[in-house]
């Protein structure tokens, strides 16, 4: 028995089209994705085979303009009109909290939401229950598949859940639910899902009957043969994982953005044991026809954000690389960019001993989600903005201890190369990392701009020292594993929201051309 | 065609222990999973265990955990139950099921257990 | 007693529309989903609706199933008099993990 499994995951809000790097389509001879080209391709492959699901394995939530509008709406909207037959949460989904996930996704999503390690308690567990499903069998061609979903047990650290769901580790919550499965006469069982590639792996190795794993939350581009645009694969699709009783378990994913529709074609034998599997991510580029009446859809939805979004606030003469494979690697202009409209938006309380009462940003790359193109006359909106600052998040002021500052950075790149987001971009700083050294003791050099002179130049971090920091909100609450900072800081005052920080910056100065300038070093 | 044929029911004295059989025949027995099912004389269907197609793992209903243990032998295509420490509330007609979805689901005859002094 | 429960009979005449319910709870049909079976007198057990909604091949459009939260229900409409059967609803309770069955309900038809 053959089955097609379509998937997609991070999509991050991409509704329309967009440039090859994911940010706003500037050329649309050359532009990607978006939910009506997706449609399209959908809609072909179901004609053509007999079999086919159509899941996304989370991050729907948070990327561009249209999540700051709609909040969700878009989302439940689309991907019903897309006849998704599955989701699992993924961590942004709770970005709003879970009053913006029940609302606008939950109630009105027309498909089954997974995740069989989130727990409710409290009032919330009735409200939820019949919303969040942990598993759902769905039957095509007189046949059954259940799809147990899983989300990452981190969301609590990457998002704002709340404190009445806990998320449990994922192997520990999946294998009940699959041995309940099979129990119930389910013996083709797929792991759907968003907690990383290691994690994917990991559930295909240690959960005992399942059969496939479709992923998401690390954005992994696999591929057999030659890629087709500019993402290199972290391996073959799919891949294949050697389970503990000795199964091969196609583990796969879509990289992100709605740029590819992840295609896999998996034949079951009689007792629901997979006997082959193959495909490939299939990318979305403009030979494949956006549908039109999706399309006109999207344009009907479209005038609420034109009027919200479209004035220009000032010209970049420069490409601003707020691109995942910079940002959370090396230093990158994008980053020196806001770092210093977060240091320019606090400038005050000067006097003849201070230049200001605050010189140092620093701002986790993970949280750049998007670069913007100078090729489009220059021009930077409200818009742009808010594909590069999705989350609505505000830049606070802490004070920390020049002890605490030096965790953070050992924490920048205790896991350096995985492309996770808590890499650091800097402003008023200067860093110097060996990773040829062990994680806890990368940091070389770690100089800081002073502030107490007249003259701003950089000095050796001290230990025993307390500076003010400007940083998102998200680190200052321990987002991406800074606990450090959470845990340490010794003043905390909320700040303004980060795109207006950011777009008053750039109205001010009218053009910008953030360089990369040796902020961030390694020896 | 799919058949499944219980065995080894009969009269037995309280405390007693009883072993059931079940033979498949007309389909691949170990792609699924299997439950026994009982009915009291002119009551309802009450579960009563249920094996994995692995047979890794097993469920058992509280009123007979740890009395009763189901197993399987996928090379004879049999289900087994094995009932000790019998009681009068254990008499039923026990039938062999594929409980599941869809064409999945198939219930043998049953195979009636008396447990009486 | 079981977890699910139903009416322990049901009646109807020829060509009326009967409706049969089974009420459970969140760890059993809140979270799982619901078959339907008829059992004739002195037969086995035989699947008519599954994944909460589903018809198995063969069996007549007049037998429809439903779930809303923690209920499930099975309506037969258009009566025949071979309809008359004692019918159960089933699903896997995950507070006790394993399948539960309705007490049944008798249909008699007038």
């Known amino acids: 028995w053959e089955l097609t499994i379509l998937h997609t995951n991070d999509v991050h809000s991409r509704l329309e089209q967009t440039s090859e790097d994911s940010s706003k389509c500037v050329n649309a001879s050359r532009c990607m994705g978006g939910v009506a080209r997706l449609f399209t391709k959908v809609q072909q492959i179901r004609r053509a085979e007999p079999n086919v699901l159509l899941l996304d394995a989370g991050d729907q939530y948070q990327g561009t303009i249209w999540f700051t509008v709609y909040k969700g709406a878009e989302v439940a909207h689309f991907m019903n009109a897309l006849r998704y037959d599955a989701m699992a949460l993924g961590n942004h989904e709770f970005d709003n909290g879970v009053e913006g996930l029940i609302e606008p996704l939950l109630k009105e999503a027309k498909f089954p939401i997974l995740s069989a390690n989130i727990k409710a308690k409290g009032p919330l567990a009735s409200q939820i229950s019949g919303l969040v499903h942990p598993y759902k069998i769905l039957h095509i061609d007189s046949e059954v598949v259940g799809i147990v979903g899983y989300t990452s047990k981190e969301t609590p650290f990457l998002s704002n859940p709340g404190t009445n769901l806990v998320f449990e580790d994922e192997i520990t919550a999946l294998q009940p639910e699959v041995d309940k499965l099979t129990a119930m006469g389910v013996n083709k069982i797929i792991a759907l899902g968003h907690s990383g590639f290691e994690m994917d792996k990991l559930i295909a190795q240690k959960v005992r009957g399942v059969d496939v794993v479709v992923g998401g939350h690390s954005n992994t581009f696999l591929y057999t043969g030659n890629p087709p645009s500019k993402e290199v694969p972290a391996g073959k699709y799919p891949f294949i994982v050697t389970s503990d009783d000795g199964r091969k378990v196609p583990v796969v994913q879509a990289y992100a953005f709605g740029k590819y529709l992840g295609y896999l074609k998996i034949e079951f034998d009689e007792r629901g044991n997979v006997i082959s599997s193959h495909g490939n991510p299939i990318l979305l580029n403009s030979s494949i026809p956006e549908d039109p009446s999706i399309k006109a859809d999207i344009n009907k939805w479209r005038i609420k954000l034109d009027n919200y979004s479209t004035q220009e606030l000032g010209k970049t003469i420069v490409y601003l690389d707020g691109s995942s494979q910079s940002c959370r690697f090396r230093e990158c202009n994008m980053g020196n960019l806001i770092c210093d409209a977060m240091i320019n938006n606090n400038l005050r309380h000067a006097d003849e001993m201070f230049w200001n009462h605050v010189s140092m940003c620093i701002l986790n790359g993970g949280g750049i989600r998007s670069p913007i193109d100078e090729r489009n006359n220059g021009t930077i909106t409200w818009e742009n903005l808010a594909a590069v600052l999705p989350f609505g998040g505000t830049f606070d002021l802490v004070q920390l201890k020049g002890s605490t500052l030096k965790k953070a950075f050992e924490h920048s790149v205790h896991r350096y190369g995985q492309s996770t987001g808590e890499f650091l971009q800097v402003g008023g700083i200067h860093v110097v990392y060996d990773l040829s050294r062990k994680p806890g003791d990368r940091v070389v050099k770690l100089d800081v701009l002073c502030t107490k002179c007249r003259v701003p130049s950089y000095d050796p971090l001290k230990m025993d020292e307390v500076y003010k920091v400007i940083l998102p909100n998200f680190l200052a609450n321990g987002g991406d594993g800074f606990q450090m900072i959470k845990d340490e800081l010794l003043r905390h005052d909320s700040g303004d929201q980060d795109i207006n920080v950011v777009s008053t910056y750039i109205s001010k100065m009218k053009v910008i051309y953030p360089a990369v300038e040796g902020r961030i070093k390694f020896s | 065609e799919v058949q499944l044929l219980e065995s080894g029911g009969g009269l037995v004295q309280p405390g007693g222990s009883l072993r059931l059989s079940c033979a498949a025949s007309?389909?691949?027995?170990?792609?699924?999973?299997y439950s026994w099912v009982r009915q009291a004389p002119g009551k309802g269907l009450e579960w009563v265990s249920a094996i994995s197609g692995s047979g890794g793992r097993t469920y058992y209903a509280d009123s007979v955990k740890g009395r009763f243990t189901i197993s399987r032998d996928n090379s004879k295509n049999t289900l087994y139950l094995q009932m000790n420490s019998l009681r009068a509330e254990d008499t039923a007609v026990y039938y062999c099921?594929?409980?599941?979805?869809?064409?999945?689901?198939?219930w043998g005859r049953g195979t009636l257990v008396t447990v009486s002094s | 007693q079981s977890v699910l429960t139903q009416p322990p009979s049901a009646s109807g005449t020829p060509g009326q529309r009967v409706t049969i319910s089974c009420s459970g709870s969140?760890?059993?049909?809140?979270?799982?989903?619901v078959n339907w079976y008829q059992q004739l007198p002195g037969t086995a057990p035989k699947l008519l609706i599954y994944l909460d909604n589903l018809r198995l091949s063969g069996v007549p459009d007049r037998f429809s199933g439903s779930k809303s939260g923690t209920s499930a229900s099975l309506a037969i409409s258009g009566l025949q008099s071979e309809d008359e059967a004692d019918y159960y609803c089933?699903?896997?309770?995950?507070?006790?993990?394993?399948?539960?069955f309705g007490g049944g309900t008798k249909l008699t038809v007038l």
């Open positions: 969140l760890s059993n049909i809140g979270r799982n989903p």
């Open positions: 007309g389909f691949t027995f170990s792609s699924y999973a």
């Open positions: 099921a594929r409980l599941g979805y869809g064409r999945v689901d198939e």
């Open positions: 089933a699903t896997w309770d995950d507070s006790h993990p394993g399948w539960t």
